[in-house]
Amino acid sequence: EVEKTACPSGKKAREIDESLIFYKKWELEACVDAALLATQMDRVNAIPFTYEQLDVLKHKLDELYPQGYPESVIQHLGYLFLKMSPEDIRKWNVTSLETLKALLEVNKGHEMSPQVATLIDRFVKGRGQLDKDTLDTLTAFYPGYLCSLSPEELSSVPPSSIWAVRPQDLDTCDPRQLDVLYPKARLAFQNMNGSEYFVKIQSFLGGAPTEDLKALSQQNVSMDLATFMKLRTDAVLPLTVAEVQKLLGPHVEGLKAEERHRPVRDWILRQRQDDLDTLGLGLQGGIPNGYLVLDLSMQEALS
C-alpha cells in the first residue's frame, strides 16, 4: 500500500490527455500534479474519465484550493461540476456569466439540482441583483426559475430584467410572486403605447391591483377569459359591471361559462342583479333590487 503512493517511473503526467484514462485511481492521485490539473482543466471535459477517476481529480483540486476554487478553474469544470456538493460551491465566488452558462450547460435537460440552485444563489448574491442577462440565461435553462424564488428574492429583480421574461416563465408563479413582479413589469413597460403595453403586461396581471384594472378597462384591451380568471379576486371585486364589460370587450360572453368559478363567482355576488342583467348573459346571484350594500372593508378602515 505504501509503495502505491509513489508515482511509478515514467508515469508522471506532463499534461492532461487521453492516456490518463488508463491510470488506476491511485496512479492518478500519485502522478497528476494538482497545479497542472488546474491550468489544464479545459481538457478534462474532452476525456472520458470514469466517475471514480473524476473523484480523484476533484480531491486533488480540493487539496490545492481548500478555500474554494478560483473562477479560472470553475469555468472549465465541465462534468466535474456534477461531483461538487453544495458545500463546495458555497466556497466559490462566481462573477462571470460565461462561467454560469458553462456549468448550467453541464446540467442541461435535468431538473435543477441542489448544486445548481446553490451555484445560482451564489452568482446572484455576488451580483447584488438579478439583472436582465442573468435572468435571460436562467430562464433559458430553467423556464420555471423565476417562480422558484421567494417574494423577498424577487424584490431584488430590477425592472429591466422583466424584458427577459416570457409568458411561460410565469406559468408556475403563485399570486404572491406575481404581486411582486407585476409592479416591476409596469415600471419596465411604461414607455410603451396601449396595445403593445397590454401584450407585454398581460402575463403579469395576476398581481395587478384594482386601480390598474380600472385604468386598463379604459384602453379597449379586450382581455381574454384565461387572463381574467388569473386576476386577484380582491382586485376584481370592486370592479363595476361596466368596467368588466370594457375590460373584456367581446370576451365578456365567456363570463357565463365561468360563473361558478373564482373570481367570477365572487364578483357576481357583489354586483346588483339589475347591472348584471344589462350584460344579457343570464348571470344569476347578484344583489336583488332594493337591498342596501354595506362596504364592510371600508367600515373596518374607518374604525
Epitope: 404581486d179 411582486v180 413582479l181 414607455n191 403595453y197 403586461i201 385604468a215 378602515a301
Partner: antibody, heavy 122, light 106 residues
C-alpha cells in the same frame, strides 16, 4: 381633499439611520403606488424608489440599493422610508408622493407630502 | 447613466409664451412628465404622459415630446407661474429628473 402628511425634521449623525413616515388622510391610501424623491439644498429632484399598494413590491434607484428600505403598514395607511449609513451628502428634504392620475402604465406623482428635512451632521 | 438636460433659466413677459425644453437621448421614445416647484413648496405635477394635464392644472400648460426633446409650453404666462420646472422620464431602472429650469416672469 387627499393629503400626505410626513413626519417632522430630523438631525442625524453620519453612519446613523433615519426613518421617515408618510401618512394619508382623506381617502383610501392603500390603493396607490407611493414613491420617494429627495432634494438636497439648492439642488434638483432625485428619485429614490417606489412601493406598490400592498407593500410587497419595491424598486429602488441603483444609487440607493442596499441603503434604502421602503415599507408599508396598510392598517394605518402609512408608508415608511428608511435610509441607513447616512453621510453629509444625504442632507436633503425627503418627499413622498402618490401616483393617482388615471393611467394604465405611468407613475406620474400628483399628490405630494410636505417634505421632511433630514440633516446629517457630526 | 441617462441624463435629461434643461436650460438653467427662461425669462418671459406676462401674457407671453414660455417654452422649456428637456433633452435626452431618444426621449421621444419615452413618456415625459413635468413638475412645477415654487420656493419652499413641494413639487406639483403639471403634465404627464407627454401632453396630459392633471385635473386642476390650467389649460395654458401644454406639453409635447418627439425626437430627443420634450417641451413644456406655458401660453399667456402669469406671475404665479414663476417657479422651477423639472422634466422627468423613466430609463431602464430609474426615474430621471431633468436639471431644472427657473422661469422668471419679468
Amino acid at each position: 381633499e387627499v393629503q400626505l402628511v410626513q413626519s417632522g425634521a430630523e438631525v442625524k449623525k453620519p453612519g446613523a439611520s433615519v426613518k421617515v413616515s408618510c401618512k394619508a388622510s382623506g381617502d383610501t391610501f392603500n390603493r396607490y403606488y407611493v414613491q420617494w424623491v429627495r432634494q438636497a439644498p439648492g439642488q434638483g429632484l432625485e428619485w429614490m424608489g417606489i412601493i406598490n399598494p400592498s407593500g410587497v413590491s419595491t424598486t429602488y434607484a441603483q444609487k440607493f440599493q442596499g441603503r434604502v428600505t421602503m415599507t408599508r403598514d396598510t392598517s394605518t395607511s402609512t408608508v415608511y422610508m428608511e435610509l441607513s449609513s447616512l453621510r453629509s451628502e444625504d442632507t436633503a428634504v425627503y418627499y413622498c408622493a402618490e401616483s393617482r392620475v388615471p393611467g394604465y402604465n405611468i407613475f406620474a406623482m400628483d399628490v405630494w407630502g410636505q417634505g421632511t428635512l433630514v440633516t446629517v451632521s457630526s | 447613466s441617462y441624463e435629461l438636460t434643461q436650460p438653467p433659466s427662461v425669462s418671459v413677459s406676462p401674457g407671453q409664451t414660455a417654452s422649456i425644453t428637456c433633452s435626452g437621448d431618444k426621449l421621444g421614445d419615452k413618456y415625459a412628465s413635468w413638475y412645477q416647484q415654487k420656493p419652499g413648496q413641494s413639487p406639483v405635477l403639471v403634465i404627464y404622459q407627454d401632453n396630459r394635464r392633471p385635473s386642476g392644472i390650467p389649460e395654458r400648460f401644454s406639453g409635447s415630446n418627439s425626437g430627443n426633446t420634450a417641451t413644456l409650453t406655458i401660453s399667456g404666462t402669469q406671475a404665479m407661474d414663476e417657479a422651477d420646472y423639472y422634466c422627468q422620464a423613466w430609463d431602464s431602472d430609474t426615474y430621471v429628473f431633468g436639471t431644472g429650469t427657473k422661469v422668471t416672469v419679468l
